[in-house]
């Protein structure tokens, strides 16, 4: 496979990763698929420094990240360990609130207007951030 050594056009490089910030909204699953089509993933926040970087770029706008608990426990889309990793939830979040009247609870995490995290209904059309790592071989699958 080939290694990506610089970020694609319209992506922002930071600490050996590339970030892309949407200008419109999609449901969490559609945002996740969009990032995958770009050979990326929804942003995985692993440090306070990365949190501040993303927060600076998205501003005070609800924005999806690559964290969900649709199958039970909270999981990052790239396999980063949730339990031992960085967290920045709002007070009393996540709460899996059922009172929204949309059916079910809240299974997808997003940045809120102050940057802290909240769980919300995955179907809400929020903006999103894609991330891909530099110097990572793009494991091209073998041809069948």
């Amino acid at each position: 496979g080939s290694e990506r050594t610089c970020c694609p056009v319209n992506w922002v490089e930071h600490e050996r990763s590339c970030y892309w910030f949407s200008r419109s909204g999609k449901a969490w699953a559609d945002a996740d698929n969009y990032c995958r089509l770009e050979d990326a993933h929804l942003v995985v926040v692993t440090s306070w420094e990365e949190q501040k970087f993303v927060q600076h770029h998205i501003g005070p706008v609800n924005t999806w990240m690559g964290l969900h608990d649709q199958n039970g426990p909270w999981k990052w889309v790239d396999g980063t360990d949730y339990e031992t990793g960085f967290k920045n939830w709002r007070p009393e979040q996540p709460d899996d609130w059922y009172g929204h009247g949309l059916g079910g609870g809240e299974d997808c995490a997003h940045f809120t207007d102050d940057g802290r995290w909240n769980d919300d209904v995955c179907q809400r059309p929020y903006r999103w951030v894609c991330e891909t790592e530099l110097d990572k071989a793009s494991q091209e699958p073998p041809l069948l």
Epitope: G1, S2, P8, N10, S22, R23, S24, G25, K26, A27, A29, D30, N33, Y34, R36, L37, E38, D39, P125, S138, Q139, E140, P141
Partner: antibody, heavy 121, light 107 residues
Framework: EVQLLESGGGLVQPGGSLRLSCAAS????????MSWVRQAPGKGLEWVSA????????FYADSVKGRFTISRDNSKNTLFLQMNSLRAEDTAVYYC??????????????WGQGTTVTVSS | DIQMTQSPSSVSASVGDRVTITCRAS??????LAWYQQKPGKAPKLLIY???SLQSGVPSRFSGSGSETDFTLTISSLQPEDFATYYC?????????FGQGTKVEIK
Amino acid sequence: EVQLLESGGGLVQPGGSLRLSCAASGFTFSTYAMSWVRQAPGKGLEWVSAISGSGVNTFYADSVKGRFTISRDNSKNTLFLQMNSLRAEDTAVYYCAKLGKDYYYYGMDVWGQGTTVTVSS
Amino acid sequence: DIQMTQSPSSVSASVGDRVTITCRASQGISSWLAWYQQKPGKAPKLLIYDASSLQSGVPSRFSGSGSETDFTLTISSLQPEDFATYYCQQANSFPWTFGQGTKVEIK
């Protein structure tokens, strides 16, 4: 000039297999997602499958999931569609298409001329 | 899946006419909509993306508008080469889906 050229279509019996190819030229193939779209005789367009630039991530219509496999060889600038367990309803002209992008992926901006697949006994 | 419904299914018009085709999505798709033109025996051609952005090389008589569920393709002054079938396509959610097509015929 940006070009896509499909090949591999033909007549195949129900339950049979076929592999379509799409040769790309005139652009940096590995940096673009690609797609297959089909059109049954006298019918409209139906999206079949898409694949990311590296080939790692793939997407399928429910009608072909588990039977068709999209792949690509970026060293040869070629897109593939492996079609197994073919059915009469898979009979169509198959087009490969490049996904254009500016800030977003926005649509299929370059299309091949199409290759005809006929599934019949 | 998101259903895309075009109307009318066909329209008869004369050269110079203003032609409007509508496309309705079964749920909101923001502006994730493209329009294509297809002539018999030929591959489709991208006309409009992001609901209202004109693809490079496409004549300015073509325009698109709308957002969420209701979209329009307008040909301001129909030319002989515009007689064709037009399709809308949503790219908001997989599976991507097309409208059933609108055939623009000579009156």
